[in-house]
C-alpha cells in the first residue's frame, strides 16, 4: 500500500533582482490537494469541499503561521542566490513527510531554481543530495552557506520540521480526512458521432479512491493497442476522489463488439457501448 503523505509546495519569484512580496503555496494530503495559500487574504485556505468540511478553523491558522514562516525563509534564501541574472526567476521548495504501513516515517525537502532541482535533503538524517550539474552544485553551495549563517538552520531545526509535518499528518489522518478507504468508480460510456461512419466512444470513471485505476477499451474481449486509445490524466475532482477517461474511434454499427474494461482496487467490470439512439449509458456504482 502507498504510504500516507503530506506534501507542501512553496514558490517565490524574483524579477530583475526584486523578490516578490508574498509567495505561492499549496498542500497535498495523500496526493489530494487540500490547501492553497490565498495571497490576497494572506491565509491558508481549504481546497476542495472535503478539506473544508473535515478540518477545523485551527488547522488553517496553524497552516498559515507555518507557511508564512516558510515563505519568508524562502524569500530570504532567494534574495541570497548570487547567480540571478535579469528576468524572472523562481525558487521552489517541496517538503514531504510520509507514514508507511509498518509505521516507519520519511521526511524530505527538495529545492528547485527556475524549475531545476539543485538540492534534496533527508529531514531525518540531514543528509543532502546535490545533482551533478555545475549549476546545481553552485546553487546548493550558495544556499547552504547562507543557511549556515542563519542560526535557525540547525539540525534541531530540521528535526523539528520533520516532527511538525508528521504531527500534522497524524492529526489529519485522525480527523478522518484521508482514511484509507476504497471508493469504487462510477463509470459511464458516451458516444459522439464523427464523420465517415466512425464514432468516438468515451469511457469516463469518476469519484473513485485510491488513485490507481486501469481503464481500457476492448474489442471482442481483447484490449486495443495503446496507439488506438487516448487517455486523460487521473485528476483530483475536488471531493477527495479522482476522475479519468479513455476514448477510441470505432466503426458505426460495430458498437456491440466494444466494451470499456475497468479495474480498481481488486474489483473489475466491463461496460458496453450504448447502441442505437441511447448514446449515453450510465453504469451505477456497485458497492
Amino acid at each position: 500500500a502507498e504510504p500516507h503523505s503530506l506534501r507542501y509546495n512553496l514558490m517565490v519569484l524574483s524579477q530583475d533582482g526584486s523578490v516578490q512580496s508574498g509567495f505561492l503555496a499549496e498542500g497535498h494530503l495523500d496526493g489530494q490537494p487540500f490547501l492553497r495559500y490565498d495571497r490576497q487574504k494572506r491565509r491558508a485556505k481549504p481546497q476542495g469541499q472535503w478539506a473544508e468540511n473535515v478540518l477545523g478553523a485551527k488547522t488553517w491558522d496553524t497552516e498559515t503561521e507555518d507557511l508564512t514562516e516558510n515563505g519568508q525563509d524562502l524569500r530570504r534564501t532567494l534574495t541570497h542566490i548570487k547567480d540571478q541574472k535579469g528576468g524572472l526567476h523562481s525558487l521552489q521548495e517541496i517538503r514531504v513527510c510520509e507514514i508507511h504501513e509498518d509505521s516507519s516515517t520519511r521526511g524530505s525537502r527538495h529545492f528547485y531554481y527556475d524549475g531545476e532541482l539543485f538540492l534534496s535533503q533527508n529531514l531525518e538524517t540531514q543528509e543532502s543530495t546535490v545533482p551533478q550539474s555545475s549549476r546545481a552544485q553552485t546553487l546548493a553551495m550558495n544556499v547552504t552557506n547562507f543557511w549556515k549563517e542563519d542560526a535557525m538552520k540547525t539540525k534541531t531545526h530540521y528535526r523539528a520540521m520533520q516532527a511538525d509535518c508528521l504531527q500534522k499528518l497524524q492529526r489529519y489522518l485522525k480527523s478522518g480526512v484521508a482514511i484509507r478507504r476504497t471508493v469504487p468508480p462510477m463509470v459511464n460510456v458516451t458516444c459522439s458521432e464523427v464523420s465517415e461512419g466512425n464514432i468516438t466512444v468515451t469511457c469516463r470513471a469518476s469519484s473513485f479512491y485510491p488513485r490507481n485505476i486501469t481503464l481500457t477499451w476492448r474489442q471482442d474481449g481483447v484490449s486495443l493497442s495503446h496507439n488506438t486509445q487516448q487517455w486523460g490524466d487521473v485528476l483530483p475532482d475536488g471531493n477527495g476522489t479522482y476522475q479519468t477517461w479513455v476514448a477510441t474511434r470505432i466503426r458505426q454499427g460495430e458498437e456491440q463488439r466494444f466494451t470499456c474494461y475497468m479495474e480498481h482496487s481488486g474489483n473489475h467490470g466491463t461496460h458496453p457501448v450504448p447502441s442505437g439512439k441511447a448514446l449515453v449509458l450510465q453504469s451505477q456504482r456497485t458497492d
Partner: antibody
C-alpha cells in the same frame, strides 16, 4: 456587507501627531486579509502607507517608516494610523482599505489638513 | 520602488466609443497589477486584479490586458457613468505603488 469607515480630527498643527481610526463592520479584522491605510494628496496622487495584517504583523512604506505606526483594537474591530511630526505636505484624504495585495473594499475617506 | 507611469493624464472620448488606458511599470511585475475607478468625491473602486480578472459586479465592457511592464485597461462602448479617473496599482513587492491616474471625459 463589508464596510470601512475612517474618523479623525480634520485639522492638525505641524509637528503634532495625527491619529486616525478605521472601524470595520461586516467582517472581522482578525479573520484574514491585511488592513491598509492609503492617502490621496490634493493633486490626486495615491500613496500606500502601510498595513496591519489579520495576525497583527505590520508592513510600512519605507518613505514613512520612521513616523508611522499602525495598531488595532480587536475587541472593537478597529485599526488605527498614527503619523508623527506631521508637515503641511501630509495634507490629504486618508482612506482605510482591505487587501493583502490589491484593495477590494475602501472607506469613504477622511480629509486631513495640516496647518498652523 | 517600482514606479507606475500613466502617460495620458486626460482622455476625451465619444459616448459609445472605445478607450484604452496604458500603465507602464519601471520593472517587470508579472501581471501583479490592479485597476481602479474613482469618481469625484468617492473612494477608488477595484475593477480588475491580476491584470485581467474582472471583479464581481464590474460590467463586461471593462477588460484588462498586458504582461511584463506594459498593461492596458480597455473600455468598450463608453457610457456616461464611466466618466472617472482610472488608476493602476502593482503588488509585486512592497511598497505597493499607484500610477498617477488617467482622467476620462466625454467628448
Amino acid at each position: 456587507e463589508v464596510q470601512l469607515e475612517e474618523s479623525g480630527p480634520g485639522l492638525v498643527k505641524p509637528s503634532q501627531s495625527l491619529s486616525l481610526t478605521c472601524t470595520v463592520t461586516g467582517y472581522s479584522i482578525t479573520s484574514d486579509y491585511a488592513w491598509n491605510w492609503i492617502r490621496q494628496f490634493p493633486g490626486n496622487k495615491l500613496e500606500w502607507m502601510g498595513y496591519i495584517s489579520y495576525s497583527g504583523s505590520t508592513n510600512y512604506n519605507p518613505s514613512l517608516k520612521s513616523r508611522i505606526s499602525i495598531t488595532r483594537d480587536t475587541s472593537k474591530n478597529q485599526f488605527f494610523l498614527q503619523l508623527n511630526s506631521v508637515i503641511t505636505e501630509d495634507t490629504a484624504t486618508y482612506y482605510c482599505a482591505r487587501g493583502g495585495t490589491y484593495f477590494d473594499y475602501w472607506g469613504q475617506g477622511t480629509t486631513l489638513t495640516v496647518s498652523s | 520602488d517600482i514606479v507606475l507611469t500613466q502617460t495620458t493624464s486626460y482622455l476625451s472620448v465619444s459616448l459609445g466609443g472605445r478607450v484604452t488606458i496604458a500603465c507602464k511599470a519601471s520593472a517587470h511585475i508579472n501581471n501583479w497589477l490592479a485597476w481602479y475607478q474613482q469618481k469625484p468625491g468617492n473612494a477608488p473602486r477595484l475593477l480588475i486584479s491580476d491584470a485581467t480578472s474582472l471583479e464581481t459586479g464590474v460590467p463586461s465592457r471593462f477588460s484588462g490586458s498586458g504582461s511584463g511592464k506594459d498593461y492596458t485597461l480597455s473600455i468598450t462602448s463608453l457610457q456616461t457613468e464611466d466618466v472617472a479617473t482610472y488608476y493602476c496599482q502593482h503588488y509585486w513587492s512592497t511598497p505597493w505603488t499607484f500610477g498617477g491616474g488617467t482622467k476620462l471625459e466625454i467628448k
